[in-house]
């Protein structure tokens, strides 16, 4: 097979014919050294998935349910290109499965038992698989056959295409359960009509259904959405209140050696030449001999799926939970309202050891999951492999953009017993230099810089945000002669000062000696000119407070702070000489786990928090000899957020704006994936 050939998998005679036409037309418009199409015919989409996994084909377009099959072992395929619908300016690659109710009803998602339900059709995504998958563990046992369990859960339903003889309750609201538009309650509009007419109490449809059926806002305001956290929201807020986000139609390829760049090059060229309204001879999004051949007829074009986005992230936690429940039919033994152990995400093996000790001391109420970077941990929390971790504000922003929520804040200044209920203002992000140097904020160009990590608040977002507004470009590695900013590209000058050791050089975790607050300060002590840290860093590592060899003889007076007005001040004066106020670190979790995480952590800190005085013979949650493992070592307590329970409210408008501006310079693959 030529290196630049993409072997497209076709699943019918008609698809194979269109594929050959696709191949021939692409040959006529692409250079001979460009990508080419070859066609492979298989009997089904599942056969195509297997063929791609076995390297007998390279690509196929799949619906969401099949993307799930493609991702499962041993296939291990991943999404590489998404079809989009709507306009190029506002491309839609996903739809949202929602539960719609009338505003004047008074039940929540966890009170659906005994209500009347309206569905688009048996086995359909938004109308059946997702809602029933998510409700699966609440269905009465035995849960097989599924239709019988659903019939016994709701007091009456309309499920078009169901067997009305075997399961009459499923057709109670639409006698016969007709499987076409002859049934007035069939499909999306029909299921909504079933709710509108008062036949049902809830309709399982997609987010656009309400807008397509009710042009008038006043009419739409008579309806609400049920959210998974047992609240309700207006129908406009479907992005924050849905059962699952469902990808429409996606090209998949192998995770390793999958030719994703070549596939994108091919499809990008294809849409330029043969996309909507581009060519009379061949149309990519048209199927004269059938419907939706190779690609959906309704598609308007393609978007490249960000490389960080694997199938789990693409399909989303809710969708995977729903489909897995339906397919595997397994439910936890504990009732769903009981908090299972919380899986903490630990960064590399240093945090893992502390987490393991916590796990032992918590009698297994805490379990541990590891990842090599903060972004990998956030991704694990998103997809359910982990539940929670404590994050610097810069990562609270990324986690928030990825759908996670802040749960508790680390407090550093408030003494107990008021600590748990106090909202602190934050800490100061500062620039530290040696007293012996002549550096100021205005002459940093060409100097050696030390950062906690890329994407962190005091070490990156605040200083680089200020720098960006001064230099108007993102080439920070050219501004400083060299530095250590863990998480930078390995060949960047901002990895040059890092200490490693070797395979971990410049990695954003504790295996890199210059990582974090203490690491950035060590970098200044040993190699750098300026360190961007929190205001407490110098006092915490001088005067013998840090017993490590590099720190034990350091004196506080040998360091000073840079002020934005060009002056310098003592490290004792951060209130009058700082770059900005930074939001405290905070614990984040998925929405569905937030209450459990909060309850458990408040309980854990009562046992292992700052009230424990002797950490040499007791486990201490907020202690790790200046290494800030799992939590900052100067944490006094974890505090309730009260109404600051979204990332925007928690971080504050000013900080969110600053980080949003810095997104022009973003090197965060996860952020790119989460905003796709």
């Amino acid at each position: 097979v030529p290196e630049k050939s993409v072997r497209w998998c076709a699943v019918s005679e008609h698809e194979a014919t269109k594929c050959q036409s696709f191949r021939d037309h692409m040959k006529s418009v692409l250079p001979s050294n460009g990508p080419s199409v070859a066609c492979v015919k298989k009997a089904s989409h599942l056969d195509c998935i297997r063929a791609i996994a076995a390297n007998e084909a390279d690509a196929v377009t799949l619906d969401a349910g099949l993307v799930y099959d493609a991702y499962l072992a041993p296939n291990n395929l991943k999404p590489v290109v998404a079809e989009f619908y709507g306009s190029k300016e506002d491309p839609q690659t996903f739809y949202y499965a929602v539960a719609v109710v009338k505003k004047d009803s008074d039940f929540q998602m966890n009170q659906l038992r005994g209500r009347k339900s309206c569905h688009t059709g048996l086995g359909r995504s938004a109308g059946w698989n997702i809602p029933i998958g998510l409700l699966y563990c609440d269905l009465p046992e035995p849960r097989k056959p599924l239709e019988k369990a659903v019939a016994n859960f709701f007091s009456g339903s309309c499920v078009p295409c169901a067997d009305g003889t075997d399961f009459p309750q499923l057709c109670q609201l639409c006698p016969g359960c007709g499987c076409s538009t002859l049934n007035q309650y069939f499909s999306y509009s029909g299921a909504f009509k079933c709710l509108k007419d008062g036949a049902g109490d809830v309709a399982f449809v997609k987010h656009s259904t309400i807008f397509e059926n009710l042009a008038n806002k006043a009419d739409r305001d008579q309806y609400e959405l049920l959210c998974l956290d047992n609240t309700r929201k207006s129908v406009d807020e479907y992005k924050d209140c849905h059962l699952a986000r469902v990808p429409s139609h996606t090209v998949v390829a192998r995770s390793v050696g999958g030719k994703e760049d070549l596939i994108w090059e091919l499809l990008n060229q294809a849409q330029e030449h043969f996309g909507k309204d581009k060519s009379k001879e061949f149309q990519l999004f048209s199927s004269p001999h059938g419907k939706d051949l190779l690609f959906k007829d309704s598609a308007h074009g393609f978007l490249k799926v960000p490389p960080r986005m694997d199938a789990k992230m693409y399909l989303g936690y809710e969708y995977i939970t729903a489909i897995r429940n339906l397919r595997e039919g397994t439910c936890p033994e504990a009732p769903t309202d009981e908090c299972k152990p919380v899986k903490w995400c630990a960064l590399s093996h240093h945090e893992r050891l502390k987490c393991d000790e916590w796990s032992v001391n918590s009698a297994g109420k805490i379990e541990c999951e590891s990842a090599e970077t903060t972004e990998d941990c956030i991704a694990k929390i998103m997809n359910g492999e982990a539940d929670a971790m404590s994050l610097d504000g810069g990562f609270v922003y990324i986690a928030g953009m990825c759908g996670l929520v802040p749960v508790l804040a680390e407090n550093y200044n408030t003494p107990n017993p008021n600590c748990e209920n106090t909202a602190e203002e934050g800490y100061f992000a500062v620039a530290v230099v040696k007293s012996s140097s002549d550096l100021t904020w205005d002459n940093l160009k060409g100097k050696k810089s030390c950062h906690t990590a890329v994407g962190r608040t005091a070490g990156w977002n605040i200083p680089m945000g200020l720098l960006y507004s001064k230099i108007n470009h993102c080439r920070f590695d050219e501004f400083f002669s060299e530095g250590c900013a863990p998480g930078s590209e390995k060949n960047s000058s901002l990895c040059k000062l890092c200490m490693g050791p070797s395979p971990n050089l410049c990695e954003p975790n504790n295996k890199e000696g210059y990582y974090g607050y203490t690491g950035a300060f060590r970098c200044l002590v040993e190699k750098g000119d300026v360190a961007f840290v929190k205001h407490q860093t110098v006092p915490q590592n001088t005067g013998g407070k840090n017993p490590d060899a590099w720190a034990k003889n350091l004196k506080e007076e040998d360091y000073e702070l840079l002020c934005l007005d060009g002056s310098r001040k003592s490290v004792q004066e951060p209130a009058n000489c700082h770059l900005a106020r930074a939001p405290n670190h905070a614990v984040v979790a998925r929405k569905d786990k937030a209450d459990c995480v909060q309850t458990l952590l408040l309980d854990q800190q009562r046992m292992f928090g700052s009230s424990v005085t002797d950490c040499s013979s007791n486990f201490c949650l907020f202690e790790s000899k200046t290494k800030d493992l799992l939590f900052r070592d100067d944490t006094v307590c974890l505090a309730k957020l009260h109404d600051r329970n979204t990332y925007e409210k928690y971080l504050g408008e000013e900080y969110v704006k600053a980080v949003t501006n810095l997104r022009k310079c973003s090197t965060s693959p996860l952020l790119e994936a989460c905003t796709f």
């Epitope: 050891l353 000790e357 001391n361 790790s624 290494k627 493992l629």
Partner: nanobody
Framework: QVQLVESGGGLVQAGGSLRLSCVAS????????MAWYRQAPGQQRELVAG???????HYADSVKGRFTISRDNAKNTLYLQMNSLEPEDTAVYYC???????????WGQGTQVTVSS
């Protein structure tokens, strides 16, 4: 700082038992938490069982009901009683006292446990 030396490993048939010991060079009475870890070839080191100063224990799901951790502060020794051994339990077993700084990669020689089917 206390040094730890593991012993008691060996080759055993599936279904058999072994008792691992870990002797400390100093007092373990004030050590908050002690634990056994294991590492199979090509795998990450994983927590098997842990015990607090007060005697509370915690086990990995894969060994619950088969392994028992205990400590004898008078003998400065940590034990791991392993029953109903399975081939998947084959690994080098290490003990740790967590009193070392978490970020110091100090591990003893460990003791090899091989379970044949």
């Amino acid at each position: 700082q206390v040094q730890l030396v593991e012993s008691g490993g060996g080759l055993v048939q599936a279904g058999g038992s072994l008792r691992l010991s870990c002797v400390a060079s100093g007092s373990i009475a004030s050590i908050a938490t002690m634990a056994w870890y294991r590492q199979a070839p090509g795998q990450q080191r994983e927590l098997v069982a842990g015990i607090t100063r007060g005697g509370s224990t915690h086990y990995a799901d894969s060994v619950k009901g088969r392994f028992t951790i205990s400590r004898d502060n008078a003998k400065n020794t940590l034990y791991l009683q392993m029953n109903s051994l399975e081939p998947e339990d084959t690994a080098v077993y290490y003990c740790t006292d967590y009193s070392r700084r978490y970020y110091e990669d100090y591990w003893g020689q460990g003791t090899q446990v091989t379970v044949s089917s």
